[in-house]
């Protein structure tokens, strides 16, 4: 199956790479603008220059284009704990990330929040913290994993998933209670 091309892609595909069809005259192929610039005016005729202008501060284009406006620079989201890794330039958007010893949790394709890497207290590091994944912890005996932290089995209620891991401790607690009732 041939993928469906949008009108703009159809028009561009008639011209050689790096050029686009003049919107008013489909017999003219104009040279695309370099990254860091945008289209101010189409080329007046074959072999003539496209009028490209540099993006203004706060905007960018990251690839060759024939956009009428540069794209607005992204802002890092403070409320999500994001920090600026590199600032926006005319040919590259802002790069946002997390602080040291934090990882990114993606709530959706283009939205992430920074969280502290788990330290695996009362456990051992099974897999180290990575850019997009928290530390994977293995808990010591007498502890179970809850929200990626090792919690004492004394906090394990019978209805929770921890009961299998903490079964001996729960039975001990139950046994102590039983012996106290006689």
């Amino acid at each position: 199956l041939v993928p469906h091309l949008g009108d703009r892609e159809k028009r561009d595909s008639v011209c050689p790479q790096g050029k686009y069809i003049h919107p008013q005259n489909n017999s003219i192929c104009c040279t695309k603008c370099h990254k860091g610039t945008y289209l101010y005016n189409d080329c007046p005729g074959p072999g003539q220059d496209t009028d490209c202008r540099e993006c203004e501060s706060g905007s960018f284009t990251a690839s060759e284009n024939h956009l009428r406006h540069c794209l607005s620079c992204s802002k890092c989201r403070k409320e999500m704990g994001q920090v600026e890794i590199s600032s926006c330039t005319v040919d590259r958007d802002t790069v946002c990330g997390c602080r040291k010893n934090q990882y990114r949790h993606y709530w959706s394709e283009n939205l992430f929040q920074c969280f502290n890497c788990s330290l695996c207290l009362n456990g051992t590091v099974h897999l180290s913290c990575q850019e997009k994944q928290n530390t994977v912890c293995t808990c010591h005996a007498g502890f179970f994993l809850r929200e990626n932290e090792c919690v004492s089995c004394s906090n394990c209620k019978k209805s929770l998933e921890c009961t299998k891991l903490c079964l001996p401790q729960i039975e001990n607690v139950k046994g102590t209670e039983d012996s106290g009732t006689t």
Epitope: K78, E79, M80, W107, N116
Partner: nanobody, 119 residues
Framework: EVQLLESGGGLVQPGGSLRLSCAAS????????MVWVRQAPGKGLEWVSH????????YYADSVKGRFTISRDNSKNTLYLQMNSLRAEDTAVYYC????????????WGQGTLVTVSS
């Protein structure tokens, strides 16, 4: 005790509007970023929008951008979601929540409010 109470849902025709509210109590509302998430029938949770404590910074999922507006009134401890140009695919239970600290889960939820978009 933290409490979040959503209201304003209902049945609306495609293209119609609704305004959801979320009344918050039990924590310092103005200090917390707040989130609207939704769950369509048989689907997982979708992050719809969020707003920071002061109301200056907002975020919208691509699916609702230009149609939904999040806002808050810190004097009333209330979060809002104005939903315009509603579509059938907006049908879901809508929940408000605090922006998750310290890990990627929600500590408190409301009971949700059902929005049904149908002709």
């Amino acid at each position: 005790e933290v409490q979040l109470l959503e209201s304003g849902g209902g049945l609306v025709q495609p293209g119609g509007s609704l305004r959801l509210s979320c009344a918050a109590s039990g924590f310092t509302f103005a200090h917390e970023a707040m989130v609207w998430v939704r769950q369509a029938p048989g689907k997982g949770l979708e992050w719809v929008s969020h707003i920071d404590g002061g109301g200056e910074s907002t975020y919208y999922a691509d699916s609702v951008k230009g149609r939904f507006t999040i806002s808050r009134d810190n004097s009333k401890n209330t979060l809002y979601l104005q939903m315009n140009s509603l579509r059938a695919e907006d049908t879901a239970v809508y929940y408000c929540a605090r922006l998750p600290p310290p890990g990627p889960w929600f500590d408190y939820w409301g009971q949700g409010t059902l929005v049904t978009v149908s002709s």
